[in-house]
């Protein structure tokens, strides 16, 4: 029961995490205009991985896609790649983990196969989460570097008369969504790996037993003479604690994503 709960919870947490990674990747607010030095601006800039947007105080928002591939910074390309890899791995992990769920019966799938699938999905979730965290962290580092560089030459004057305020960017909402989502996916993956240990069939159902013969003492370890002793590995991989009964009392809830303009 605890294994089912751990596996189910790991799946749900990973599902939420991957939904978050997808949301973060699609969001436009990876970097937002820093208003500390210009709180009275009537034009607000923010940028995502795929396009940059400008919101006017009039309420109008104009977004422009990055239609060039070669002209984009290598770091941005790297972040895009990390996020996409994270999403792909996460999606495959979700697909695998659905079939691995203990509460779902698929034909005569053996528990060892389910255990392997659970471990595989768990590892995929962990790597997916790490990709997302790495991608967001690389972008955040890029922002911090650019922020202090633009702070160094904040104002470029023309004869001291005219001021040109350089636009600085700070962390956008997508970064926090990405960090949290990556963390959730990572936690979900760890939970799946823990569940896998409980699902995996044990090598033996009994501890080693010593048999004392009248003449000389010989210690027998089960597994050595399967045919004669009958204490060998359970070739059918049936678990004693399973009892053959599987309860399908777990309901999966899928989060829905809403975009607010």
């Amino acid at each position: 029961m605890a294994v089912t709960a751990c596996q189910g919870l790991g799946f749900v947490v990973s599902l939420i995490g991957i939904a978050g990674i997808i949301a973060a990747t699609c969001m436009d607010q990876w970097s937002t205009q820093d208003l500390y030095n210009n709180p009275v601006t009537a034009v607000f800039n923010y940028q995502g991985l795929w396009r940059s947007c400008v919101r006017e105080s009039s309420g109008f928002t104009e977004c422009r896609g990055y239609f060039t591939l070669l002209g984009l910074p290598a770091m941005l390309q790297a972040v895009r790649a990390l996020m996409i890899v994270g999403i792909v791995l996460g999606a495959i992990g979700l697909l695998v983990s659905i079939f691995a769920l203990k509460c779902i019966r698929i034909g005569s799938m053996e528990d060892s196969a389910k255990a392997n699938m659970t471990l595989t999905s768990g590892i995929m979730f962990i790597v997916s989460g790490l990709c997302a965290i790495a991608g967001v962290s690389v972008f955040a580092n890029m922002l911090v570097t650019n922020f202090w560089m633009s702070t160094a030459n904040m104002y470029t004057g023309m004869g001291g008369m005219v001021q040109t305020v350089q636009t600085r960017y700070t962390f956008g909402a997508a970064l926090f969504v990405g960090w949290v989502a990556g963390g959730l996916t990572l936690i979900g993956g760890v939970m799946m790996c823990i569940a896998c240990r409980g699902l995996a069939p044990e090598e033996t159902n009994y501890k080693a037993v010593s048999y004392h013969a009248s003449g000389h003492s010989v210690a027998y370890k089960p597994g050595g003479f399967k045919a004669s002793t009958g204490f060998g590995s359970n070739t059918k991989n049936k678990k004693i604690y399973d009892g053959g009964a599987r309860t399908e009392d777990e309901v999966q809830s899928y989060p829905s994503k809403h975009d607010y303009v």
Epitope: V43, Q47, V54, S58, G59, T164, Q166
Partner: antibody, heavy 118, light 113 residues
Framework: QVQLVQSGAEVKKPGASVKVSCKAS????????IQWVRQAPGQRLEWMGY????????KYNEKFKGRVTITRDTSASTAYMELSSLRSEDMAVYYC???????????WGQGTLVTVSS | DIVMTQSPDSLAVSLGERATINCKSS????????????LTWYQQKPGQPPKLLIY???TRESGVPDRFSGSGSGTDFTLTISSLQAEDVAVYYC?????????FGGGTKVEIK
């Protein structure tokens, strides 16, 4: 077509308050921000503030902060600008305007003359 | 606040001739996010509210004759009337739309010589 119709001229005593209305028609009132601008005789145009009829968000010119209040009645598609503690230098034509691309004001009310006289 | 300075204060031009009005801002009105200049030009005739001519420094409002054109970037802007008509006699204002409070220039009065 888009129309902004303002209330009639007002004569007020110093220290009093004036409330100018601006009724919008020909478009969805809550979709566009309403700005208030005034023009004193022989002076340049002066921005006073705005209201977003959709969420009641307001922004004021610091010069008028505390004296000006911009409100709206969505059911009547009307915006209001109230200026308190009137002084002689507040004598001006007050305009409401609808905001569009580039934060520009393509549609203006006909203007309301506010005279401050003791 | 951004200070908008217009020049000249008044301008007398013959019918059919070119009229040029300048506007200078104390801070750049160029937004790096979309590379647009948040400067607007208005025309005001006596007893009337201002009329929008140009926004984003060079985008003509619909219905505005093509003899009106705007140019410039950053802090220096120009409104040009390529061939002055009698109905163009008015006061022209530039406005900062980039930063609060929105500020207007002092105006340039255009007359016929």
């Amino acid at each position: 077509q888009v129309q902004l119709v303002q209330s009639g001229a007002e004569v007020k005593k110093p220290g009093a308050s004036v409330k100018v209305s601006c009724k919008a028609s020909g478009y969805t009132f809550t979709k566009y921000i309403i700005q208030w601008v005034r023009q004193a005789p022989g002076q340049r145009l002066e921005w006073m503030g705005y209201i977003n009829p959709y969420n009641d968000d307001t922004k004021y010119n610091e010069k008028f902060k505390g004296r000006v209040t911009i409100t709206r009645d969505t059911s009547a598609s009307t915006a209001y600008m109230e200026l308190s503690s009137l002084r002689s230098e507040d004598m001006a034509v007050y305009y409401c305007a609808r905001t569009y691309y580039g934060n520009s004001f393509p549609n203006w009310g006909q203007g309301t003359l506010v005279t401050v006289s003791s | 606040d951004i200070v908008m300075t217009q020049s000249p204060d008044s301008l007398a031009v013959s019918l059919g001739e070119r009229a040029t009005i300048n506007c200078k801002s104390s801070q750049s009105l160029l937004n790096s996010g979309n590379q647009k200049n948040y400067l607007t030009w208005y025309q005001q005739k006596p007893g009337q509210p201002p009329k929008l001519l140009i926004y984003w420094a060079s985008t003509r409002e619909s219905g505005v004759p093509d003899r009106f054109s705007g140019s410039g970037s950053g802090t220096d802007f120009t409104l040009t009337i390529s061939s002055l008509q009698a109905e163009d006699v008015a006061v022209y204002y530039c406005q900062n739309d980039y930063s609060f409070p929105f500020t207007f220039g002092g105006g340039t009065k255009v007359e016929i010589k």
